[in-house]
């Protein structure tokens, strides 16, 4: 069963509000930039359900169970035509290169998920990096909108390279390090 | 007086290396793209005073300082005629606008040192950055030629953008160092 | 030595507000997040958000959003943890804590020694 | 969020090694490798042990390691030290609007 939730009958937030629980998800659509899901709520019937902002939510399990059937569904529905979704629509006159059309052909082919720069969004700025994953990777915040993802810094280097720049300059401190600074991996100083 | 800093006598760095003190920096020079310090030893004789590779050093202070002398030395230069390098008249592919030959035709008529993109070089690698001047500066490398200059971080940000991207992700060391070397904020060892 | 110094315990009554402090020294305050995490008596730890000073550009816990106010005045190297209006609920411990890398994504490797608020009629 | 799961106590004799495990799901742990672990003793702020899945701060003892499989993530502590005995947590990314998970923690008592 799903985890208690918010529900945001109206976008007030009072002190008070009461909690229910999602009994399941039902649908995704992305509105401005922001993914929604269609929740059915437990205890009340279909006619109450609600299509909720992902960052109100506290269901991830359910969230991730909804996102493997979508996947497949989806998958299933390549081969059909389809009314391009508003979110596919969308144009933006962020970067609109070759490769761009290229990769939104092959996602309009294959219904996947946008992710990253796929999304169309224009990044804002990086709020984070990692190379836990074995490529180094930057956390995108996108303008309008408070959702951020995972992208390849390859690719951010190449897309916007202005605010990788920009990331790097408010981040980067340039102290020397101790000589017993450990590993030493990256050496040559690098201070 | 300056920092501790390992004397590289050879460049195989044992284990139990002694630890030597900076008195000050008399001179500098890029020797295959990799700037250098003349060092005077604390409590040794001038005659051995020895040329260190700028990543091994930990006395920013003293660099800092003799910087200083060393470009009002070099603005003294200014005015004297003198042989164009090879440097300069070698062409460049990599930029040719208009912009460009405009401030080579005012550079031609006021005799003046080209100094940074101004030389007309293709940029190879940043090998070290400073903002002991206020703004950031790059210490840049260009293609084709062992000397190096300094370049402002805002304009090379723009020129080439790739080249600044590379030099900051060297620089990001993925372990964590111990906490005396923080402080330091944007210190100006800057690599 | 990076410190982070939080402001003192507190004691308050239900529905009165309440702002307390986490002063930030030995590094450059604005290239790090600042998160807030709070742990209630005998009980885990639980995040609550993060702010970064350079703008002021915060993430919430949905658990919290709504609840608490973030925010940071960098001129003074200062975040802020703030309630409008407080609950018996919202007695904890409540921790500062500073990035170990200015690009650290979700981990803290700095702490504050932590602010006690008791909320008590 | 939902916290992640972890065991409510473990124990072990000093010299011996013992693991903890943290246990999320595909929006958390499976998705990224992003998972922190803690060691808090009474009275105590916490202190960072392990980041980004096996990474270790300087000062930490290569006693401790981390690691993890599919949705789970876990610490392991060697040759177990009295001055081990703490509460561990284990802390994940979980995406924008979550951000960050805690788990519940885990009480770590050295024996005799």
């Known amino acids: 069963m799903g985890k208690k939730t918010k529900r945001t009958a109206d976008s007030s937030s009072s002190e008070d509000e009461e909690e229910y629980v999602v009994e399941k998800v039902l649908d995704r659509r992305v509105v401005k930039g922001q993914v929604e899901y269609l929740l059915k709520w437990k205890g009340f019937s279909e006619e109450h359900n609600t299509w909720e902002p992902e960052k109100n939510l506290d269901c991830p399990e359910l969230i991730s169970e909804f996102m493997k059937k979508y996947k497949k569904m989806k998958e299933g529905e390549n081969n059909k035509p389809r009314e391009k979704s508003e979110s596919n629509k969308r144009k933006s006159n962020f970067s609109n290169s070759a490769d761009d059309i290229k990769s939104k052909k092959k996602r309009e082919q294959s219904n996947d998920i946008a992710r990253g720069f796929e999304r169309g969004l224009e990044p804002e700025k990086i709020i984070g990096a990692t190379d836990s994953c074995g490529d180094l990777m930057f956390l995108m915040k996108w303008k309008d909108t408070d959702e951020a993802d995972l992208v390849l810094a390859k690719e951010a280097n190449v897309k916007c390279p202005q605010i990788v720049i920009a990331f790097y300059e408010e981040r980067l401190t340039w102290h020397a390090y101790p000589e017993d600074a450990e590993n030493k991996e990256k050496e040559t100083a690098k201070s | 007086m300056g920092k501790k800093t390992k004397r590289t006598a050879d460049s195989s760095s044992s284990e139990d290396e002694e630890e030597y003190v900076v008195e000050k920096v008399l001179d500098r020079r890029v020797v295959k793209g990799q700037v250098e310090y003349l060092l005077k030893w604390k409590g040794f004789s001038e005659e051995h005073n020895t040329w260190e590779p700028e990543k091994n050093l930990d006395c920013p202070e003293l660099i800092s300082e003799f910087m200083k002398k060393y470009k009002k030395m070099k603005e003294g230069e200014n005015n004297k005629p003198r042989e164009k390098s090879e440097s300069n008249k070698r062409k460049s592919n990599f930029s040719n606008s208009a912009d460009d030959i405009k401030s080579k035709k005012k550079r031609e008529q006021s005799n003046d040192i080209a100094r940074g993109f101004e030389r007309g070089l293709e940029p190879e690698k940043i090998i070290g950055a400073t903002d002991s001047c206020g703004d950031l500066m790059f210490l840049m490398k260009w293609k084709d030629t062992d000397e190096a200059d300094l370049v402002l971080a805002k304009e090379a940000n723009v020129k080439c953008p790739q080249i600044v991207i590379a030099f900051y992700e060297e620089r990001l060391t993925w372990h964590a160092y111990p906490e005396d070397a923080e402080n330091k904020e944007k210190e100006t060892a800057k690599s | 030595a990076v410190q982070l110094v939080q402001s003192g315990a507190e004691v308050k009554k239900p529905g009165e507000s309440l702002r307390i402090s986490c002063k930030g020294s030995?590094?450059?305050?604005?290239?790090?997040?600042i998160s807030w995490v709070r742990q209630m008596p005998g009980k885990g730890l639980e995040w609550m958000g993060r702010?970064?000073?350079?703008?002021?550009?915060?993430n919430y816990s949905p658990s919290f959003q709504g609840h608490v106010t973030i925010s940071a005045d960098k001129s003074i190297s200062t975040a802020y943890l703030q309630w409008s209006s407080l609950k018996t609920s919202d007695t904890a411990m409540y921790y500062c804590a500073r990035p170990l890398q200015t690009y650290s994504i979700a981990s803290v490797g700095h702490w504050g020694q932590g602010t006690l608020v008791t909320v008590s009629s | 969020a939902s916290a992640l799961t972890q065991p409510a106590s473990v124990s072990g004799s000093p010299g011996q090694s013992i693991t903890i495990s943290c246990t999320g799901t595909s929006s958390d742990v499976g998705s990224y490798n992003l998972v922190s672990w803690y060691q808090q003793h009474p009275g105590k702020a916490p202190k960072l042990m392990i980041y980004e899945g096996s990474k270790r701060p300087s000062g930490v003892s290569n006693r401790f390691s981390g690691s993890k499989s599919g949705n789970t993530a876990s610490l392991t502590i060697s040759g177990l030290q009295a001055e081990d005995e703490a509460d561990y947590y284990c802390?994940?990314?979980?995406?924008?609007?979550?951000?960050?998970?805690f788990g519940g923690g885990t009480k770590l008592t050295v024996l005799g």
């Open positions: 802390c994940s990314y979980a995406g924008s609007s979550t951000f960050a998970v």
């Open positions: 030995g590094y450059s305050f604005t290239s790090y997040w």
């Open positions: 702010i970064d000073p350079s703008d002021s550009y915060t």
